[in-house]
Interface confidence: medium
């Protein structure tokens, strides 16, 4: 399969995750016990395929309005990815463009 044109990769993926997840932080992969297709990780889901905001939200470290699964801490991220957002460095326009793309 070829990668679709509307995808999120690299820094844009991190930026968008930070925008979507806010202070909750995020995972780059999900425990296999969760929905099985998520075990591929967000890179495969969003960089190599199109993903939407709802899917991005599933990679946030704490579910927005449901109980947190404390038995599975966030996956250790590569150290070139910020684990949590650094609010004052946000480039809101970039993330707004990315999330608008995902809504389309």
């Amino acid at each position: 399969a070829y990668r679709p044109s509307e995808t999120l990769c690299g820094g844009e993926l991190v930026d968008t995750l930070q925008f979507v997840c806010g202070d909750r932080g995020f995972y780059f992969s999900r425990p296999a016990s969760r929905v099985s297709r998520r075990s591929r990780g967000i890179v495969e889901e969003c960089c190599f395929r199109s993903c939407d905001l709802a899917l991005l939200e599933t990679y946030c470290a704490t579910p927005a309005k449901s109980e947190r699964d404390v038995s599975t801490p966030p996956t250790v991220l590569p150290d070139n990815f910020p684990r949590y957002p650094v609010g004052k460095f946000f480039q809101y326009d970039t993330w707004k463009q990315s999330t608008q793309r995902l809504r389309r």
Partner: antibody, heavy 119, light 107 residues
């Protein structure tokens, strides 16, 4: 220790084919995005192709699209690059490299294998 | 695609010198920039990522700075083993792109 070892390079005539392999060890191969990057003699780095961890998704540079095919066998910890319809401008050292975090930076590279396209 | 332009193409310096290499992006890439070092006949080595973070086992004399469209790699006191070619790479999004390289040679 992470190791990437390319093989399969050599001399081929224009229009010919070659298949490069990259044997990976020292890490969980199936979890990483993998790349092929090339470097023509005396020139800079050019990314060629990228493949997702599962092998289900691929990306190609415009210069090789339709001629090269990247693939992987996670059971064998091996990355491949099938090169068809080779041209003189494909002459380069071809490196396989591990993506550090997903469409980002390349933290481990193989030693490279030279592909020479000439009549 | 985002174009990356390095300057200078060649830089002559002496052991102990402080040197700076510049990389410019054709559009803003935030801090999503890496620097690689390549010695003749060898594979590139990741030196700096996220514009300013030091790669694994990279000496502290190397540093990176910048954001947006302009970035610099600085070597505070050149050592003999630092004479190499350096490449910048943006990874804000696909396709990632490399600069054309800066060759650091002995004066």
């Amino acid at each position: 220790e992470v190791q990437l070892l390319e093989s399969g390079g050599g001399l081929v005539q224009p229009g010919g084919s070659l298949r490069l392999s990259c044997a990976a060890s020292g890490f969980t191969f199936s979890e990483y995005v993998m790349w092929w990057v090339r470097q023509a003699p005396g020139k800079g780095l050019e990314w060629v192709s990228v493949i997702s961890p599962s092998g289900g998704y691929t990306v190609y540079a415009d210069s090789v699209k339709g001629r090269f095919t990247i693939s992987r066998d996670n059971s064998k910890n091996t990355l491949y690059l099938q090169m068809n319809s080779l041209r003189a401008e494909d002459t380069a050292v071809y490196y396989c490299a591990r993506d550090r975090g997903g469409a980002t930076t390349l933290d481990y590279w193989g030693q490279g294998t030279l592909v020479t396209v000439s009549s | 695609d985002i174009q990356m332009t390095q300057s200078p193409s060649t830089l002559s310096a002496s052991v102990g010198d402080r040197v700076t290499i510049t990389c410019r992006a054709s559009q803003t890439i935030s801090s999503w920039l890496a620097w690689y070092q390549q010695k003749p006949g060898k594979a590139p080595k990741l030196m700096i990522y996220k514009a300013a973070s030091l790669g694994s086992e990279v000496p502290s004399r190397f540093s990176g700075s910048g954001s947006g469209t302009e970035f610099t790699l600085t070597i505070s006191s050149l050592q003999p083993e630092d004479f190499s070619t350096y490449y910048c790479q943006q990874y804000k999004t696909y396709p990632v792109t490399f600069g054309q390289g800066t060759r650091l040679e002995i004066k």
